[in-house]
């Protein structure tokens, strides 16, 4: 058909930078390169209908559906989604093509469905159909990588049984300790499944897909180092593969390495050795102990011995089920307003945990650091001195753990007052919780020193406001004090704050903020 326009349908994925939710044709985000959705004429349809390839979008992702129309003259358009018509603002690009866009910000279930675009040009009318669905991530998995020996080769294969297929990379480091942090220049990454260079200090394999990134470290005993603070312990679940690498460097090749489990030599087929000369002509030997699928009886002390180095051991513990060991009793802290302080949780867990810190329904990323006594620690310092309840939550495939913390910030009370016809009330935050006094100001007591004790009601049943404790004191109006100025004062160990109230006849009450001592 000669007079049909040339149409191009594209999908633009955006990297969210937390822009507000809604539909718009402006671009508040960084864009990825457009993906052609190949708009094709739909056969056997009444009228001219183009159909774009189906679009699958991750939850919370932001996209733009865009149509480029190569047709002479002006065009007008209308978007229809779930029987509602949506505004459509066509514009023209540098090649004088009509451009119509629909931006979907932070994709949700309600935004999935069929988007119909009706276009009217001078020559003809036509419809474009987009089907947008949320990608089913329920079937997605990300499993921790494990190692296998490559058949007939001295090499390790890294395997992660994940959906979608993960990208596997080896993360190698040749220096000690802190300098092997992920972004350090000492770290080398290799995006491949097979690793032949197995002599490095620190070897990890990582797998990543849409669900995130999981890593497994090659457990290593280095006979040239002093042992860890505590006898190293390696946990595995029944059926998982065991890999331990023993490494030693010596001035010449005249040394050998052996593995023993509970003082019995490992069976042939459960170990293999590699050796190489380093740059300074010293000999590096590594001896791997491995079991392709561990059983309970593989538990025990694995000792690597050398004819030229002190031996070292590791305790391998095979468990039926993963665990998280930590004390879950809640902890209360009180700190000064400018005191440096971090919450911390020390735990032992297998497999590695995923964790979050939560405050006031907001979640914060959780970092964990392995200690060299087999425990791990997670610290949270980003509390910005906000009092309230903080929650640490951790889970792995087999266990869950939650720990509560309460943070109180020591500070002087701040008083707010309000009054009605029958009573005056004062409220104060501050910690420790303040005590209250009421004083009457009169001719006899211009400095407001006459204490009021009648009709005062202090509320110690504190309500939490944004995580802060609030204490209140109420003075019931009596004839004796009507028309007088009264002063409520809240005090704790850090100071006193007062508010003065005029108890006149019903009507608005002016409040005079007193000095805070």
């Amino acid at each position: 058909n000669q007079d049909l326009p040339v149409i191009k349908c594209v999908l633009i994925n955006h990297k969210n930078n937390d822009s507000s939710v809604g539909k718009s044709s402006s671009y508040p985000m960084v864009s990825e390169s457009p993906e052609d959705l190949g708009c094709a004429l739909r056969p056997q349809s009444s009228g001219t209908v183009y159909e774009a390839a189906a679009v699958e979008v991750d939850v919370s992702a932001s996209i733009t559906l865009q149509v480029l129309v190569d047709a002479p003259g002006n065009i007008s358009c209308l978007w229809v989604f779930k029987h509602s018509s949506l505004n459509c603002q066509p514009h023209f690009d540098l090649q004088n093509r009509g451009v119509v866009s629909m931006v979907i910000l932070k994709m949700t279930e309600t935004q999935a469905g069929e988007y119909l675009l009706f276009i009217q040009s001078e020559a003809t009318n036509y419809t474009i159909l987009f089907t947008v669905s949320i990608r089913n991530t329920l079937l997605y998995t990300l499993r921790r990588p494990y190692f296998r020996k490559m058949e007939n080769q001295d090499a390790l294969v890294c395997i992660s049984e994940s959906v979608p297929e993960p990208i596997v990379e080896w993360v190698l480091c040749d220096s000690q300790g802190e300098s092997c942090k992920e972004e350090s220049p000492a770290v080398v990454k290799k995006e491949e499944k097979v690793l032949h260079e197995l002599f490095g200090t620190d070897i990890r394999c990582c797998a990543r897909n849409e669900l995130g990134r999981e890593c497994t470290r090659l457990f290593t005993i280095d006979l040239n180092q002093t042992p860890q603070t505590t006898l190293p312990q390696l946990f595995l679940k029944v059926g998982e593969p065991l890999w331990i690498r023993c490494k030693a460097v010596h001035v010449n090749h005249g040394f050998g390495l052996t593995w023993e489990l509970e003082n019995k030599a490992l069976e042939e087929g459960n170990y293999f050795e590699m050796s190489t000369y380093s740059t300074n002509r010293t000999m590096i030997r590594i001896l791997f102990a491995f079991v392709s699928s561990v059983a309970r009886n593989d538990t025990g002390y694995y000792t690597c011995s050398s004819s030229k180095h002190p031996s070292q051991s590791a305790l391998v513990t095979i468990v039926e089920k993963g665990f998280i060991n930590a004390t879950n009793s809640s902890e209360d802290y009180e700190i000064d307003q400018y005191e440096e302080f971090c919450f911390s949780v020390r735990f032992k867990a297998y497999p590695q945990i995923r964790c979050t810190w939560t405050f006031s329904r907001k979640s914060f990323p959780c970092e964990q650091k392995g200690l060299d006594n087999g425990y791990s620690i997670s610290k949270f310092c980003n509390h910005k001195h906000q009092p309230g309840e903080y929650i640490f939550h951790a889970e792995n495939d087999d266990a869950q753990f939650t720990k509560m913390f309460t943070l109180n910030i020591r500070r002087k009370p701040q008083v707010l007052a309000e009054a009605s016809a029958s009573q005056a009330s004062c409220f104060s935050d501050g910690y420790p919780l303040p005590s209250w006094t009421w004083k009457k100001c009169s001719d006899k007591s211009p400095n407001c020193t006459e204490e009021i004790t009648e009709g005062v009601w202090n509320r110690k049943a504190n309500r939490k406001v944004f995580g802060q404790w609030v204490s209140s004191s109420t003075l019931n109006m009596s004839e004796a004090i009507k028309g007088f100025l009264v002063k409520c004062c809240a005090y704790n160990s850090l100071g006193t704050s007062c508010e003065t109230i005029l108890l006149n006849s019903p009507g608005p009450f002016p409040f005079i903020q007193d000095n805070i001592s």
């Epitope: 040239n224 042992p227 505590t230 030229k308």
Partner: antibody, heavy 120, light 107 residues
């Protein structure tokens, strides 16, 4: 037989340093860790640190961190322990002790000890 | 750090007596425990390692038992040369720590 021969007694002034040596014989020097343990007069045993003679790497007790240095010379099968900024409470007998071969952090053979007296 | 608590701090016994010394760790140390004997002016000597294994050359009257946090050194029949101070030591975690010692004296 296995022997650890330590250097002789030392008298030092507060603030000075002392370096005690321990010469090993009768076994393969690099196959056993070497520990240093001290004992103040009339007191119990106090672990100071460990050295791996094979690689020379060390680990010290927190209490001595920054003041103690352990080194080794594989050509003479000797380990050294140097303690600096001496104070009167460092007066003690200093022992080198060989780590047992299989038993993780155990000690199976001890030197005779070197008496270090810190006095002004 | 793991604390090691020995009891009693001293005891008096006669030749031929059965003597028991206990040692408690502040946390579980499995069987990573050693016992040493020290005589005045001498270096300590290893008696027992791995909680119950007798070091070669040590008389069989010495025996060790226990696991986790509670351990015992037993001298089945005290001999004159056994009057000395005995120390336990945890051997699983740095810093290595010793018990305060038990002095065995002649009654």
């Amino acid at each position: 037989q296995v022997q650890l021969v330590q250097s002789g007694a030392e008298v030092k002034k507060p603030g000075a340093s002392v370096k005690v040596s321990c010469k090993a014989s009768g076994y393969s020097f690099t196959t056993h860790y070497m520990h240093w343990v001290r004992q103040a007069p009339g007191q119990g045993l106090e672990w100071m640190g460990i050295i791996n003679p094979s690689g020379g790497s060390t680990r010290y007790a927190q209490k001595f961190q920054g003041r103690v240095t352990m080194t080794r010379d594989t050509s003479t099968s000797t380990v050294y322990m140097e303690l600096s900024s001496l104070r009167s409470e460092d007066t003690a007998v200093y022992y080198c002790a060989r780590g047992s071969s299989y038993y993780y952090y155990g000690v199976d053979v001890w030197g005779k000890g070197t008496t270090v007296t810190v006095s002004s | 750090d793991i604390q090691m608590t020995q009891s009693p701090s001293s005891l008096s016994a006669s030749v031929g007596d059965r003597v028991t010394i206990t040692c408690r760790a502040s946390q579980s140390i499995s069987t990573w425990l050693a016992w040493y004997q020290q005589k005045p002016g001498k270096a300590p000597k290893l008696l027992i390692y791995a909680a119950s294994s007798l070091q070669s050359g040590v008389p069989s009257r010495f025996s060790g038992s226990g696991s986790g946090t509670d351990f015992t050194l037993t001298i089945s029949s005290l001999q004159p040369e056994d009057f000395a101070t005995y120390y336990c030591q945890q051997a699983i975690s740095f810093p290595l720590t010793f018990g305060g010692g038990t002095k065995v004296e002649i009654k």
